[in-house]
């Protein structure tokens, strides 16, 4: 990947409407098509009061496993999508889409540093479980992921592309 | 003990700009994020805006995108607000307000009042 | 940009419960915070990530928050609790902090 593309707003924010399309096509959360088990995926809510202060480096920890998770999670919809009968062309192609768009910004966050961070994590002992939720159907599981790049992921590109300027 | 303390009330003409002060004191200035946040009379909170008082780097509502600036001098560990080409719709009273895991501590408000 | 919604005002008998609410999208996915204002005075926290309480405010106060919907929840409501309440949270798309319209709670008797 080339370097610091992450940090080109514009290539988060095609991930990201990429995200909302698909949260879109699977018709609400409520009536939309079901998981055939639930999926455990990282919680996106974020004290942002908290966010900001904390180190860049702890930042990239939550990042990190965030991200790991989230690609479990679509790769798991991904696999029970191929058992069901009959799955939606437009489904099965925004999975599609979400596992190459997370490969991708994967890619993109290796570039920019944050896998060091995970290898060595600061206060390793000290750091805070990856709180977690369970997605039982397509439209949560893509609504994690637009929220989990709207927000975590943004905010720390933000924060280490600006840190890598100085 | 920790707080922020204003400047005093201004009254401003439409189309001047004003700067509000806030001067922290107790804790470590730069060790956290400094919002402003205003109310007019009879109406609710709005947030216009942070600054990180440690690197300079500031966030602003879009609604005050061009009009507004932030600044600090951590040297006195004081933020700043300035607001240019007031109107009358700008009379309000202006906040500092510290954020920890939420906004913890306010200033006492600052009013400014815009009247030809 | 994102709006949060509130009632304009709500009443409570006094030592009854007040339900106070404010809608925005999915607004159960991002913490909320609610602040009480009392005439004349800078707003003060009551309820931080959706439910947890800073030292010093009482247990009478709690927070819910689901869907479309976050509620601030006030038990055994007392004549001291008349105030305006705001709830606030985040912009995603914008990174800035939003307020609701706040609501006025009067306590009657």
């Known amino acids: 990947a080339p370097p610091r593309l992450i940090c080109d707003s514009r290539v988060l924010e095609r991930y990201i409407l990429e995200a909302k399309e698909a949260e879109n096509v699977t018709m609400g959360c409520a009536e939309g098509p079901r998981l055939s088990e639930n999926i455990t995926v990282p919680d996106t809510k974020v004290n942002f009061y908290a966010w900001k202060r904390m180190k860049v480096e702890e930042q990239a920890v939550e990042v990190w496993q965030g991200l790991s998770l989230l690609s479990e999670a679509i790769l798991q919809a991904q696999a029970l999508q191929a058992n069901s009968s009959q799955p939606p062309e437009s489904l099965q192609l925004h999975i599609d889409k979400a596992i190459s768009g997370l490969r991708s910004l994967t890619s993109l966050l290796r570039v920019l540093g944050a896998q060091k961070e995970l290898m060595s994590p600061p206060d390793a002992t000290q750091a805070a479980p990856l709180r977690t939720l369970t997605a039982d159907t397509f439209c949560k599981l893509f609504r994690v992921y637009s929220n989990f790049l709207r927000g975590k992921l943004k905010l720390y590109t933000g924060e280490a592309c600006r840190r890598g300027d100085r | 003990q920790v707080q922020l303390v204003q400047s005093g009330a201004e009254v401003k003409k439409p189309g001047a700009s004003v700067k509000v002060s806030c001067k922290a004191s107790?804790?470590?200035?730069?060790?956290?994020?400094m919002s402003w946040v205003r109310q007019a009379p009879g109406q609710g909170l709005e947030w216009m805006g942070w600054?990180?008082?440690?690197?300079?780097?500031?966030n602003y509502a879009q609604k005050f995108q061009g009009r507004v600036t932030m600044t600090r001098d951590t040297s006195i560990s004081t933020a700043y607000m300035e607001l240019s080409r007031l109107r009358s719709e700008d009379t309000a009273v202006y906040y500092c307000?510290?954020?920890?895991?939420?906004?913890?501590?306010w200033g006492q408000g600052t009013l400014v009042t815009v009247s030809s | 940009s994102y709006e949060l919604t509130q009632p304009l005002s709500v009443s409570v008998a006094l030592g009854q419960t007040a339900r106070i609410t404010c809608s925005g999208d999915?607004?159960?996915?991002?913490?909320v915070y609610w602040y009480q204002q009392k005439p004349g005075q800078a707003p003060v926290l009551v309820i931080y990530?959706?439910?947890k309480r800073p030292s010093g405010i009482p247990e009478r106060f709690s927070g819910s928050n689901s869907g479309n919907t976050a509620t601030l929840t006030i038990s055994r409501a007392q004549a001291g609790d008349e105030a305006d309440y705001y709830c606030?949270?985040?912009?995603?798309?914008?990174?800035?902090?939003?307020f609701g319209g706040g609501t006025k709670l009067t306590v009657l008797g």
């Open positions: 307000a510290r954020e920890g895991m939420y906004f913890d501590i």
């Open positions: 107790g804790y470590t200035f730069t060790s956290y994020y």
């Open positions: 600054i990180n008082p440690l690197k300079g780097n500031t």
């Open positions: 999915s607004i159960g996915d991002k913490y």
């Open positions: 990530d959706t439910n």
């Open positions: 606030q949270s985040w912009d995603l798309d914008f990174n800035t902090y939003v």
